[in-house]
Interface confidence: medium
């Protein structure tokens, strides 16, 4: 198996951002909301997620990944057109199968450069490489048929489609190695709100004990949980009211199918 020594995009590595504000550090501001936003990271030359507090901050803040990339990555839209026209596949499509370091059992798909097709493989649950897709369709769009692909070369970030490693919550042990469990969430077609409202409560990594609220999409209610002060996910609100206001609107009434794994 061959692997990349460095997974940053060399094509972008030497470029300067399009706007000066793209060089600013992510600034969550002084307020306490938990708003998923994106910023351009000057060091990694990628647009990355951060949590915005809801007020102040700076201009290096975008509502969507796409908007961030269009604004801050030089040549991003040209690259997108090139990929859509079938000129080239992302480099990671050519990486060989890598189940990663853990010993879980997750059904994933990779692009096989020998057969020129996307194929199923078993992913162990953490790290590994970027030739790793949750669905056959996603693999095909990005690696097999980039001619018809709406996904630009730089669009793919592992975080968009792979759940790696050990979360602090929702875990089980396989062969003495902790591996992640798929969170039990309502079917996405029954929920049209913010995607993070579907995430399970995550107490995070630190040692504090802060009262927070998370939205339970199965019940349509916001429940209390203890947050440890860092890490975790975006389904985390300082008040029940803020939680309901952010997440309740997305529930489609009378269509709940319970939970799926």
């Amino acid at each position: 198996l061959s692997e990349e020594a460095d997974d940053t995009d060399s094509e972008l590595g030497s470029m300067k951002p399009l706007h000066t504000f793209c060089a600013m550090k992510a600034d969550d501001g002084p307020c306490k909301a938990m708003i998923r936003s994106y910023f351009f990271n000057m060091y990694t030359h990628q647009c990355e997620e951060f949590i915005y507090g809801g007020c102040e901050g700076n201009e290096n803040r975008f509502d969507t990944l796409e908007e961030c990339k269009k604004t801050c990555i030089p040549g991003y839209e040209k690259t997108a057109v090139k990929a859509a026209s079938g000129a080239e596949r992302p480099d990671f499509c050519f990486l060989e199968e890598d189940p990663g370091l853990c010993r879980g059992y997750m059904k994933r798909y990779l692009y096989n450069n020998q057969t020129k097709q996307c194929e199923r493989f078993v992913y162990g649950g953490c790290l590994g490489n970027r030739n790793n897709f949750e669905t056959l369709d996603e693999c095909k769009k990005i690696c097999e048929n980039p001619v018809h692909s709406p996904s630009p070369v730089n669009e793919v970030q592992m975080s968009d489609y792979v759940t790696d490693g050990n979360t602090v919550t929702d875990r089980s042990t396989v062969n003495n190695i902790v591996v992640p469990q798929s969170p039990k969430v309502p079917r996405r077609r029954d929920y049209r709100g913010r995607p993070w409202c579907l995430q399970p409560a995550d107490s995070g990594l630190c040692k504090a004990s802060e009262r927070r609220f998370y939205y339970n999409s199965a019940t349509g209610k916001c429940h209390r949980f203890n947050y440890t002060g860092c890490g975790g996910n975006n389904n985390n609100f300082t008040t029940r009211r803020r939680c309901l206001r952010s997440c309740k609107t997305g529930l489609i009434k009378n269509k709940s199918k319970g939970v799926v794994k």
């Epitope: 198996l1 061959s2 692997e3 990349e4 020594a5 460095d6 997974d7 940053t8 990271n41 060091y43 990694t44 990628q46 990355e48 997620e49 951060f50 890598d98 370091l101 853990c102 010993r103 162990g124 953490c126 790290l127 590994g128 490489n129 970027r130 970030q157 592992m158 975080s159 792979v162 759940t163 790696d164 490693g165 050990n166 979360t167 602090v168 190695i177 992640p180 995430q199 995550d202 995070g204 990594l205 860092c230 890490g231 975790g232 996910n233």
Partner: antibody, heavy 121, light 107 residues
Framework: QVQLQQSGPGLVKPSQTLSLTCAIS??????????WGWIRQSPGRGLEWLGI?????????HYAVSVKSRITINPDTSKNQFSLQLNSVTPEDTAVYYC???????????WGQGTLVTVSS | DIQMTQSPSSLSASVGDRVTITCRAS??????LAWYQQKPGKAPKLLIY???SLQSGVPSRFSGSGSGTDFTLTISSLQPEDFAVYYC?????????FGQGTKVEIK
């Protein structure tokens, strides 16, 4: 160029907590393409991997079984650094402690300068 | 845990010599192996990853080979700056583990 700068005390008393910090420049602790680990080195044990954290939409961690009950590795996104806490130390925890960056694959391509921590009363 | 055993534990060689160090894993780790060089008072430096891929900036006199359980690091023509301790590391599964090291000394 990625650089890792370690800080923390060189002497810790038995039963106390060892705390070290690793400040990152040239990369981001919450990068989607990196992982951040601690490794220690002592004459008796050689190089010993202690644990790793990484961010992929949320934070994940893996710890060595030998220290699992005593170790915490935390990110600090506001300061772009990560820390090691090792509780209830004994003289056997005396070692040079290194922080290091791993890429996707679990190989350590950048290392801190190392901190000799002596556990002694 | 996967045990990594290096041999020899030390060797003496002269500048210009071809040097070979081996690393054996206690189970099949495919090609999930790295080699590091460490000089006194310094942190280890990544030389080879994925058993045979040369890390950026590392001189081409260093090469790695092997797969499964047996791996080799070769220095084709030893230079004065190559006298150091060399370690292998597996990343096939957690916990990540290192070999005990091979010290390359001046003859």
């Amino acid at each position: 160029q990625v650089q890792l700068q370690q800080s923390g005390p060189g002497l810790v008393k038995p039963s106390q907590t060892l705390s070290l910090t690793c400040a990152i420049s040239g990369d981001s602790v919450s990068s989607n393409s990196a992982a951040w680990g601690w490794i220690r080195q002592s004459p008796g044990r050689g190089l010993e991997w202690l644990g790793i954290i990484y961010y992929r939409s949320k934070w994940y961690n893996h710890y060595a079984v030998s220290v699992k009950s005593r170790i915490t590795i935390n990110p600090d996104t506001s300061k772009n650094q990560f820390s090691l806490q090792l509780n209830s130390v004994t003289p056997e925890d005396t070692a040079v402690y290194y922080c290091a960056r791993s890429n996707w694959s679990g190989y350590f391509d950048y290392w801190g300068q190392g901190t000799l921590v002596t556990v002694s009363s | 845990d996967i045990q990594m055993t290096q041999s020899p534990s030390s060797l003496s060689a002269s500048v210009g010599d071809r040097v070979t160090i081996t690393c054996r894993a206690s189970q099949d780790i495919r090609n999930n192996l790295a080699w590091y060089q460490q000089k006194p008072g310094k942190a280890p430096k990544l030389l080879i990853y994925a058993a045979s891929s040369l890390q950026s900036g590392v001189p081409s006199r260093f090469s790695g080979s092997g797969s499964g359980t047996d791996f080799t690091l070769t220095i084709s023509s030893l230079q004065p700056e190559d006298f150091a301790v060399y370690y292998c590391q597996q990343r096939n599964g957690f916990p990540l583990t290192f070999g005990q090291g091979t010290k390359v000394e001046i003859k």
